[in-house]
């Protein structure tokens, strides 16, 4: 039974997107009063694992020496103190890449684009898939995806971007997946470098002009709403 204890923090190192066969460590950080840590995996018998705290007792380590599809999924952790069990942590989604062959990522009409114009990133898989994800390196919200609404299998997904601005420039990769597990992704596509030239930009300085530090919906190809009735793909914001 969840008590009034504050929830612990759950994270993965080196990250939550792990290639098949690589090692990953899941950390759960509670309080100095913690006596035991428990890790639960969604749709698996609880507890998935238990660990004694590491000194000074405020965290525990859960090791996965070699990433496989069995480890992909959603995790939460708890800690037990003398007064009972804590609230659950926020969920950690551990994703495995390398489950399917890599898709191809291209830019239409070209990866060289002028500010103020549009570009469409096209992710194509050899076999039909129902989820396509686009990742921009160093973006604040790197995961965007198109998912089939009715199990319709697709060989490709289009990610439209407009108007293109300087913050769209950078390196993109895409993944494909099957809807039965959102946590199993293909190998990443080869990187695509999008280069934005600024010939359409207003040359006058603006008093509010600043460097954009967050890559958000405007400089991502998707928005958190909407659907694609003709292709059967639905947009999701991750």
């Amino acid at each position: 039974q969840a008590g009034p204890l504050p929830k612990p923090t759950l994270w993965a190192e080196p990250g939550s997107v792990i290639s098949w066969g690589n090692s990953v460590t899941i950390w759960c950080q509670g309080t100095l009063e913690a006596r035991e840590y428990r890790l639960d995996k969604e749709e698996s018998p609880a507890p998935w694992d238990r660990q004694n705290p590491l000194e000074p007792k405020n965290k525990a380590r859960f090791s996965i020496p070699s990433m496989t599809e069995d480890y992909a999924g959603r995790y939460r952790c708890y800690y037990r103190s003398p007064v009972g069990w804590s609230q659950p942590s926020d969920p950690l989604e551990l994703v495995m890449t390398g489950a399917y062959s890599k898709p191809t990522l291209s830019a239409l009409p070209s990866p060289l684009v002028t500010s103020g114009k549009s570009v469409t990133l096209l992710c194509q898989s050899r076999s039909p898939m129902d989820t396509f994800l686009l990742i921009k390196e160093r973006a604040a919200h790197p995961l965007l995806h198109l998912r089939s609404e009715h199990g319709a299998q697709q060989h490709q997904a289009e990610f439209p971007m407009s108007p293109v601005t300087s913050v769209h420039g950078g390196t993109y990769r895409c993944f494909s997946s099957h809807g039965f597990s959102h946590y199993l992704l293909s190998h990443p596509s080869d990187p695509l470098e999008l280069i934005v030239s600024g010939s359409l930009e207003d040359p006058r300085p603006s008093p509010t002009r600043s460097v954009s530090t967050a890559a958000g919906p405007e400089d991502q190809p998707l928005m958190p709403t909407g659907s694609v009735p003709h292709s059967g793909l639905r947009r999701h914001w991750e």
Partner: antibody, heavy 118, light 107 residues
């Protein structure tokens, strides 16, 4: 719920100035580009200006270039349109609209009316 | 600039009808075509973006199609609340431009 509320409209003399504001709420203002669009009485919609999320990209319609300035105050979640050297043909309902990032404007304000007349 | 043309400025239809509104661009806009609804009170709403993608909360009776320079909006089962003016807009290149609008009226 996404909300955009324009203000600052009114009657202005030809050659005069006016500053419109658009207060945004219900979303993270700092990560969306925003547009101004206008509609003259009994006419269609006309795109006026765009400012990107970080204000580092700005575009204007040729009809307002050099006279209008779009800007934003991110801490205050507010978009502005400074209009100078106003002409009778600038008489319109002015709307602010959020840029979807996909070439569309996905949420619009209710508009504020500007009348340029002597 | 890209010119957008809605050849029909007004259209009369009955409740329950299937209605199509067309829009033509002066050059290929690569599917960056959006449809908006403007009610008599002036309120504007996005219906369809990127030719055929339904915006959040928009009834499924609205659909869009087209490619290149020719696009259309279809309302499959006209409802009383659909009586409005419909505008197409290209989002391919700034300056973004709108069609002149098609006013939908009841017969």
């Amino acid at each position: 719920e996404v909300q955009l509320v324009e203000s600052g409209g009114g009657l202005v003399q030809p050659g005069g100035s006016r500053k419109l504001s658009c207060a945004a709420s219900g979303f993270t203002f700092s990560v969306f580009g925003v547009h101004w669009v206008r509609q003259a009485p009994e006419k269609g919609l006309e795109w006026v200006a765009y400012i990107s999320s970080g204000s580092n990209t700005i575009h204007y319609a040729d009809t307002v270039k050099g006279r209008f300035t779009i800007s934003r105050d991110i801490p205050k979640n507010t978009l502005f349109l400074q209009m100078t050297s106003l002409r009778s043909e600038d008489t319109a309902m002015y709307y602010c609209a959020r840029s979807s990032g996909t070439g569309a404007m996905d949420y619009w304000g209710q508009g504020t009316s500007v009348t340029v007349s002597s | 600039d890209i010119q957008m043309t809605q050849s029909t400025s007004s259209l009369s239809a009955s409740l329950g009808d299937r209605v199509s509104i067309s829009c033509r661009a002066s050059q290929d806009i690569s599917n960056y075509l959006n449809w908006y609804q403007q009610k008599p009170d002036g309120a504007v709403k996005l219906l369809i973006y990127y030719t055929s993608r339904l915006h959040s909360g928009v009834p499924s009776r609205f659909s869009g199609s087209g490619s290149g320079t020719d696009y259309s909006l279809t309302i499959s089962n006209l409802d009383q609340e659909d009586i409005a003016t419909y505008f197409c807009q290209q989002g391919n290149t700034l300056p973004w431009t709108f069609g002149g609008g098609t006013k939908l009226e009841l017969k």
